[in-house]
């Protein structure tokens, strides 16, 4: 099997970590966030060819079928495996708070 | 906010769970599966238009994102939420045995 | 390179009020958001409050609600803090912190040198 | 609201030693922790964000670990110039709270 780590398509194509710089307002966070006024948001983006960075049986079987029947059928995706969290200070009924949220920004990839 | 579950694509052209019928040989398993011969493999398929099943807050972000930076940041994915497991008659070094998979079948799907 | 430079020390009477300025330099002043932070003689740090220079937004603690007012003036990159009917317990080093904010959190990366603000009869 | 508990509230120690403070917080912070140093006369001085992320210019003697509701701050060999008083301060939660400082002194 192939090393799953491996981009068979080239250097940086296939599934990892991103970073995009973004504002509250790329967001759409401007009306309720008051605090970082930018973010590097972390995303998963790239290929998912065969055998890489499967992140179970499901992500195998998807691809023997999107092979198979490739218009009925996609390719896995690459999508986050874990998270980290971030704090935000944001505007609520009452005021302000400082906020952790846990499923902000992506902390590694796989293919699913 | 628009429904978190309305299709605003048209019926079922949207994130949900499908079912596909497929072989062993299709599964690519032929070489290691006893039995079930042939398996109906639920999985998620389907477009992830803005609001509709986003998993998280990063969903959120994505979407935002990729209305802003097309070229850059996919949209998000239709991707299992949840597993159902199945349990494979398989073969081993020493015979066959009776193996539980927690990772075979969506159960339910969002969009990440 | 970033600085926050504070007014001079002051002396008041129980009753008064104090305004200290905290004027930034060296980034964007509108960026990062600004706490105040005191120290009683001999004591340790008491976090004040916080205000957002984009916004004006404000957090004041809960122990310093109704007396305390903290503003920016976005034109001369300037925060102030103010505290009113000022009592001997006032009597302490106010800094002001820019309080930067993304993704590995918040901290107070930098600090004014400290405004000795002492209430006394 | 959040509280810091220090300790040592002080510790006597020479240049070379390893010293090791503590900080526990009332509730989980995550690591939404920092440290600050703190010499007589100045104002505090950012070390260590996150738990555990080094501040720029630091030396790297000083180390930050822990999540949840325990941390440490170790200097790895002290130095002259780090005679101070240290505190932790919580950046989880409104209102943010300090820890009751820990002064390392020259034994």
């Known amino acids: 099997a192939r090393n799953g780590d491996r981009c068979p398509l080239g250097p940086g194509r296939c599934c990892r970590l991103h970073t995009v710089h973004a504002s509250l307002e790329d967001l759409g966070w401007a009306d309720w966030v008051l605090s970082p006024r930018e973010v590097q948001v972390t995303m998963c983006i790239g290929a998912c060819p065969s055998q890489f960075r499967e992140a179970n049986m499901h992500a195998q079987i998807k691809m023997n079928l999107h092979r198979l029947k490739p218009d009925t059928v996609p390719a896995p995706c690459c999508v986050p495996a874990s998270y980290n969290p971030m704090v935000l200070i944001q505007k609520t009924d009452t005021g302000v708070s400082l906020q952790t949220y846990d499923d902000l920004l992506a902390k590694d990839c796989h293919c699913v | 906010a628009r429904n978190g579950d309305r299709c605003p694509l048209g019926p079922g052209r949207c994130c949900r769970l499908h079912t596909v019928h497929a072989s062993l040989e299709d599964l690519g398993w032929a070489d290691w599966v006893l039995s079930p011969r042939e398996v109906q493999v639920t999985m998620c398929i389907g477009a992830c238009p803005s609001q509709f099943r986003e998993a998280n807050m990063h969903a959120q972000i994505k979407m935002n994102l990729h209305r802003l930076k097309p070229d850059t940041v996919p949209a998000p994915c239709c991707v299992p939420a949840s597993y159902n497991p199945m349990v494979l008659i398989q073969k081993t070094d020493t015979g066959v045995s009776l193996q539980t998979y927690d990772d075979l079948l969506a159960k339910d799907c969002h969009c990440v | 390179q970033v600085q926050l430079v504070q007014s001079g020390a002051e002396v008041k009477k129980p009753g008064a009020s104090v305004k200290v300025s905290c004027k930034a330099s060296?980034?964007?002043?509108?960026?990062?958001?600004i706490s105040w932070v005191r120290q009683a003689p001999g004591q340790g740090l008491e976090w004040m409050g916080w205000?957002?220079?984009?916004?004006?937004?404000?957090f004041y603690a809960q122990k310093l609600q109704g007396r305390v007012t903290m503003t920016t003036d976005t034109s001369t990159s300037t925060a102030y803090m103010e505290l009113r009917s000022l009592r001997s317990d006032d009597t302490a080093v106010y800094y002001c912190?820019?309080?930067?904010?993304?993704?590995?959190?918040?901290?107070?990366?930098?600090w004014g040198q400290g405004t000795l603000v002492t209430v006394s009869s | 609201d959040i509280q810091m508990t220090q300790s040592p509230s002080s510790v006597s120690a020479s240049v070379g030693d390893r010293v090791t403070i503590t900080c526990r917080a009332s509730?989980?912070?995550?690591?939404?922790l920092a440290w600050y140093q703190q010499k007589p006369g100045k104002a505090p001085k950012l070390l260590i964000y996150?738990?555990?992320s080094l501040q720029s210019g630091v030396p790297s003697r000083f180390s930050g670990s822990g999540s949840g509701t325990d941390f440490t701050l170790t200097i790895s060999s002290l130095q002259p110039e780090d005679f101070a008083t240290y505190y932790c301060?919580?950046?989880?939660?409104?209102?943010?709270?300090f820890g009751g400082g820990t002064k390392v002194e020259i034994k």
């Open positions: 996150a738990a555990s």
């Open positions: 301060q919580q950046v989880h939660s409104f209102p943010i709270t």
């Open positions: 509730q989980g912070i995550d690591s939404w």
């Open positions: 912190a820019r309080t930067r904010h993304d993704t590995s959190g918040l901290r107070f990366d930098y």
């Open positions: 205000i957002s220079a984009y916004t004006a937004d404000t």
């Open positions: 060296g980034y964007t002043f509108t960026n990062e958001g």
